[in-house]
């Protein structure tokens, strides 16, 4: 004979557990139905009546099958430096994601609580470590023989051009200036960028001491409220 299908609520066999989407109610000592995502338990089960579920109210949610007496509150609205990548519905919490050009300074289980603008390295400093989702850019002073003349979240220090005859020697924030005769090695105009988030160009290669011969026209997107153009002392 096939086993009888028990309908909730029912008393489980000793040593057995309730089925999927059921829970054991300690008070009723019965297996009872859980409420579906988007609902909560309005009335708990008894020995003779099953769980009564009700829809979550506006701005509240339940993501899982549950028997909670109240739905969870959705997180606060996203700030201007964030994007709502997942809306608050009866079945899911709101998720806020930092806009391009920002990183997550204070994470939540899902999304970000607090965003901060990516640091921009000032002239004389280059990017030592690029920014990520949850970490800021790290700047470093340009070593002798290299320079950066930009305020940027992506530019690394690049070598001075080598001149046959130097008109003005280069320093950390300026390239060498050659006399009218061609330099031995002509450096490309524009900045060298890390193959990194936050650059608007996407075909970057790993940075090398030598820039490519093609000029770069990368720029940092002014996403949302513009991050302050912070100088950095490389800390």
């Amino acid at each position: 004979l096939p086993a009888q299908v028990a309908f909730t609520p029912y008393a489980p066999e000793p040593g057995s557990t309730c089925r999927l989407r059921e829970y054991y109610d300690q008070t009723a000592q019965m297996c009872c139905s859980k409420c579906s995502p988007g609902q909560h338990a309005k009335v708990f089960c008894t020995k003779t009546s099953d769980t009564v579920c009700d829809s979550c109210e506006d701005s509240t949610y339940t993501q899982l099958w549950n028997w909670v007496p109240e739905c969870l509150s959705c997180g606060s609205r996203c700030s201007s430096d964030q994007v709502e990548t997942q809306a608050c519905t009866r079945e899911q919490n709101r998720i806020c994601t930092c806009r391009p050009g920002w990183y997550c300074a204070l994470s939540k289980q899902e999304g970000c609580r607090l965003c901060a603008p990516l640091r921009k390295c000032r002239p004389g400093f280059g990017v030592a470590r690029p920014g990520t989702e949850t970490s800021d850019v790290v700047c470093k002073p340009c070593a002798p023989g290299t320079f950066s003349n930009t305020t940027s979240s992506t530019d690394i220090c690049r070598p001075h051009q080598i001149c046959n005859v130097v008109a003005i020697p280069g320093n950390a924030s300026m390239d060498a200036v050659c006399t009218s005769t061609s330099p031995t090695r002509s450096m490309a105009p524009g900045a060298v960028h890390l193959p990194q988030p936050v650059s608007t160009r996407s075909q970057h290669t790993q940075p090398t001491p030598e820039p490519s011969t093609a000029p770069s026209t990368s720029f940092l997107l002014p996403m949302g409220p513009s991050p302050p153009a912070e100088g950095s002392t490389g800390d």
Epitope: T85, Q86, I95, T97, G131, T134, P197
Partner: nanobody, 118 residues
Amino acid sequence: EVQLVESGGGLVQAGGSLRLSCAASGRTFSDYGMGWFRQAPGKDSEFVAAINWSNGRTNYADSVKGRFTISRDNAKNTGYLEMNSLKVEDTAVYYCAATPSGKAYSYWGQGTQVTVSS
């Protein structure tokens, strides 16, 4: 690292349609959430649409709801923005962006120009 390249922009008359593509390389695109942003001359960038990295759910700016559709093809490592009933005010450079875990859009492309004429 993820590199993103947008395409499909162009000049279209009001009421027309365009389909933007965002080709990703360098990492498994399916692991990333994807969003589209746009920036009109002299204006701050504006969020357009997003697709969740874990459950594929989508979210749209009010200004494009019902007209734009975001989607992705993980096999082709490409995301899309289908734009219908275009309006003059949709004119902007459109950027796709990627987020590894939904905390920040830490990668984006160079953008593609969309111009809607009356």
